[in-house]
């Protein structure tokens, strides 16, 4: 699966859009998780509304917000007030029961605000208006079309 690299400025908001086949993923909730290490588990950060019909409503966990346009097939995640500690590898997931299918892998990079090193005076930008989608760099790997369910305990 391709990895998309997104860069955001510290203190601002970073918006991530993951697209998917709306029919294939009909009725499925979506989630945003943070990968713990290269091969480690993906720790759930936030998921869409429990009632799939209400997936368009924004759901928040701390500074992360998720909303799903199930007709268009786009799930949008917003990382607000981006901090250096938010940098890392994330996944957009489609949930089929407890099975999570990876829709997209996203590498978030946080750029230091150059204003941090100078006296910015009273200059500030309202958080809501400073959304940054960043440059995308894709690392290609082949997608295995035939997968078996992982063993469950």
């Amino acid at each position: 699966l391709n990895t998309t690299v997104l860069q955001g400025m510290a203190g601002q908001s970073l918006r991530v859009s993951c697209t998917y086949d709306a029919l294939k993923h009909w009725g499925r909730r979506k989630a945003w998780c943070r990968q713990l290490g290269e091969e480690g588990p993906c720790q759930r950060v936030v998921s869409t509304h429990g009632v799939w019909l209400l997936a368009f409503l924004k759901k928040r966990n701390g500074s992360t917000v998720i909303a799903d346009d199930t007709l268009a097939g786009t799930v949008t995640i917003t990382l607000k007030n981006l901090q250096a500690g938010d940098a890392g590898l994330y996944q957009c997931q489609s949930l089929r029961g407890r099975e999570a299918e990876v829709l997209q892998k996203v590498l978030v990079e946080v750029l230091e605000d150059p204003l941090d090193d100078q006296d910015a005076g009273d200059l500030w930008v309202p958080e809501e208006s400073s959304s940054f989608e960043g440059a995308q760099v894709e690392h290609s790997t082949s997608r295995n079309q035939e997968t078996s369910f992982p063993p469950t305990s």
């Epitope: 294939k24 499925r28 009632v51 035939e146």
Partner: antibody
Framework: EVQLVQSGAEVKKPGESLKISCKGS????????IGWVRQMPGKGLEWMGI????????RYSPSFQGQVTISADKSISTAYLQWSSLKASDTAMYYC???????????????WGQGTMVTVSS | EIVLTQSPGTLSLSPGERATLSCRAS???????LAWYQQKPGQAPRLLIY???SRATGIPDRFSGSGSGTDFTLTISRLEPEDFAVYYC?????????FGGGTKVEIK
């Protein structure tokens, strides 16, 4: 009318190959996942695997992984279940079924084929 | 994998009586992913209930589903002659999806 029509009964010898089919009609075949379910004589239902005809994304139950191959040809709205080397224990009724996703995220097989009886005997 | 245990294995009742079928899961199952099917001899299964309690299209209201967690129930309020069949529960919550062993409802 929404329906799934399966190919006819088959009698095969152990070691032979086989491909059975399931043709969908009355709906957009690429809009729903299609599953395969096995029912051995006098027994219950077993979930084998599922395919999304739109892109042929396929999932298998661990019990059937490597034993069968599920495929689809969206141009003719048909899903397939195949064996490269049949065993006597493959004797069973095989059903294809359409998976419906309902408004609240529920999943269930809402439309079933009539079944294909596969008999493997020397 | 999640094991679904249905009980009783066979239920002997007369037309007009109430039938209560149980489906117990080896671990918790989300209600959204629990379905019930009816199968008559020589026929394919038919969807009765999805989401633990929602009736499928064309299913009479004498069929109802309930339950959550590990215990689910299918109730047929008044048995009609055509209701004598085998009933299966199925979960889609955990991979791989699994079916219960079935409950046969037979005429007493």
């Amino acid at each position: 009318e929404v329906q799934l029509v399966q190919s006819g009964a088959e009698v095969k010898k152990p070691g032979e190959s086989l491909k059975i089919s399931c043709k969908g009609s009355g709906y957009s075949f690429t809009s729903n996942w299609i599953g395969w379910v096995r029912q051995m004589p006098g027994k219950g239902l077993e979930w084998m695997g599922i395919i999304y005809p739109g892109d042929s994304d396929t999932r298998y139950s661990p019990s059937f992984q490597g034993q069968v191959t599920i495929s689809a040809d969206k141009s003719i709205s048909t899903a397939y279940l195949q064996w490269s080397s049949l065993k006597a224990s493959d004797t069973a009724m095989y059903y294809c079924a359409r998976e419906a996703g309902y408004d609240y995220g529920e999943l269930a097989f809402d439309i079933w084929g009539q079944g294909t009886m596969v008999t493997v005997s020397s | 994998e999640i094991v679904l245990t249905q009980s009783p294995g066979t239920l002997s009742l007369s037309p007009g009586e109430r039938a209560t079928l149980s489906c117990r899961a080896s671990q918790s199952v989300s209600s959204s992913y629990l379905a019930w099917y009816q199968q008559k001899p020589g026929q394919a299964p038919r969807l009765l209930i999805y989401g633990a309690s929602s009736r499928a299209t064309g299913i009479p209201d004498r069929f109802s589903g309930s339950g959550s967690g590990t215990d689910f129930t299918l109730t047929i309020s008044r048995l009609e002659p055509e209701d004598f069949a085998v009933y299966y529960c199925q979960q889609h919550d955990s991979s791989p999806p699994t079916f219960g062993g079935g409950t046969k409802v037979e005429i007493k």
